[in-house]
């Protein structure tokens, strides 16, 4: 058993049929010695008396808020949560496996630039009685500070008959150095509590590996005289790291017909313009990627040829 936060404790249980469970001793936080009784949740049934209560925790029915009282007055509370271990593996019932970039990916993180600010998100089908708390650091043995905000419901999507909820959190490395080579990874730890179930999820990454620029901005077409060709121009996104001479992007320009089956013409360039043939009813799209490190491409910015 360990303390998650004040008056909230996590009991770690090997979860299999007829498991013996864990013996837990609760102590009432009071100078009183006599006349103390204990109850669980909303029940008025007295579970025991005295300053300590010893219980055998085997299942979710044994978890919950234990309260010690004296003469009708509440003295203190202890909330017990369960963390299940099945076949030596901690349960991952609360979050959905996003399966990208690999199986057992519960947390996904992205950064728009090298400023040390990043966003992580996760998915669940659970809509109520759910809380998250997030901690992060650079390295684990001698951790350097990363400050994270509160996890917030950020999207809701229908998947078949179910609703899927996405939660996001923003974090900022306290002393980020955008141009420095990273040697220690960022660690992100998420505590998830659903009703009386506790789970924890972790992710470890370098900022350089989670970079995904915003799409190029101000995408414009300029027709070339007496030609089907157009000059496409764009700018670096506002959110990209500066100076651009050091933090450089490369771009992919794509001409896509109305039908997805039509052949796509693609041009790659380090410049912020390109000349392409604009077909009728086609659209021109541009996306960006770090020029010197193959992290993710941005989403596409698009304009119609017409």
């Amino acid at each position: 058993i360990w303390e998650l936060k004040k008056d909230v404790y996590v009991v770690e249980l090997d979860w299999y049929p007829d498991a013996p469970g864990e013996m837990v001793v609760l102590t009432c936080d009071t100078p009183e010695e006599d006349g103390i009784t204990w109850t669980l949740d909303q029940s008025s049934e007295v579970l025991g008396s005295g300053k300590t209560l010893t219980i055998q925790v085997k299942e979710f029915g044994d978890a919950g808020q234990y309260t010690c009282h004296k003469g009708g007055e509440v003295l203190s509370h202890s909330l017990l949560l369960l963390h299940k271990k099945e076949d030596g593996i901690w349960s991952t019932d609360i979050l959905k496996d996003q399966k990208e970039p690999k199986n057992k990916t519960f947390l996904r993180c992205e950064a728009k630039n090298y400023s040390g600010r990043f966003t992580c998100w996760w998915l669940t089908t659970i809509s109520t009685d759910l809380t998250f708390s997030v901690k992060s650091s650079r390295g684990s043995s001698d951790p350097q500070g990363v400050t994270c905000g509160a996890a917030t419901l950020s999207a809701e999507r229908v998947r078949g008959d179910n609703k899927e909820y996405e939660y996001s959190v923003e974090c900022q490395e306290d002393s980020a150095c955008p141009a420095a080579e990273e040697s220690l990874p960022i660690e992100v730890m998420v505590d998830a509590v659903h009703k009386l179930k506790y789970e924890n999820y972790t992710s470890s990454f370098f900022i350089r590996d989670i970079i995904k620029p915003d799409p190029p901005k101000n995408l414009q077409l300029k027709p070339l005289k007496n030609s089907r060709q157009v000059e496409v121009s764009w700018e670096y996104p506002d959110t990209w790291s500066t100076p651009h001479s050091y933090f450089s992007l490369t771009f992919c320009v794509q001409v896509q017909g109305k039908s997805k089956r039509e052949k796509k013409d693609r041009v790659f360039t380090d410049k912020t313009s390109a000349t392409v043939i604009c077909r009728k009813n086609a659209s021109i799209s541009v996306r960006a990627q770090d020029r010197y490190y193959s992290s993710s491409w941005s989403e596409w910015a698009s304009v119609p040829c017409s």
Epitope: R117, L153, S154, S168
Partner: nanobody, 115 residues
Framework: EVQLVESGGGLVQPGGSLRLSCAAS????????MYWVRQAPGKELEWVST????????RYADSVKGRFTISRDNAKNTLYLQMNSLKPEDTSLYYC????????RGQGTQVTVSS
């Protein structure tokens, strides 16, 4: 008292653009994640987009991704939704909201996409 006042809706042809605005007051706007939701006649309220309090994180429904852009100006307490390449199926009453479920939302602004 929390107030959210949307504007910028109107009638537009398919492929056209509109920019919606939402003026917020009565709460600390710069501390709040904000949302756009919409409701078509006879349909359920639908989440469209989300932006974090800093503006760094944005999220979009699959149906609008690549066409709509959410942004905010914390100095002006204003939320925006730039809508490009509009389609007839985007026709809805659009609300800005302080929660994704739309319980804390404004009166809405009507967007009609029709030729």
């Amino acid at each position: 008292e929390v107030q959210l006042v949307e504007s910028g809706g109107g009638l537009v042809q398919p492929g056209g653009s509109l920019r919606l605005s939402c003026a917020a007051s009565g709460f600390t706007f710069s501390d709040s994640w904000m949302y756009w939701v919409r409701q078509a006649p006879g349909k359920e309220l639908e989440w469209v987009s989300t932006i974090s309090n800093s503006g760094f994180t944005t999220r979009y429904a699959d149906s609008v991704k690549g066409r709509f852009t959410i942004s905010r100006d914390n100095a002006k307490n204003t939320l925006y939704l730039q809508m490009n390449s509009l389609k007839p199926e985007d026709t809805s009453l659009y609300y800005c909201a302080r929660d994704l479920g739309g319980a804390l939302r404004g009166q809405g602004t009507q967007v009609t996409v029709s030729s």
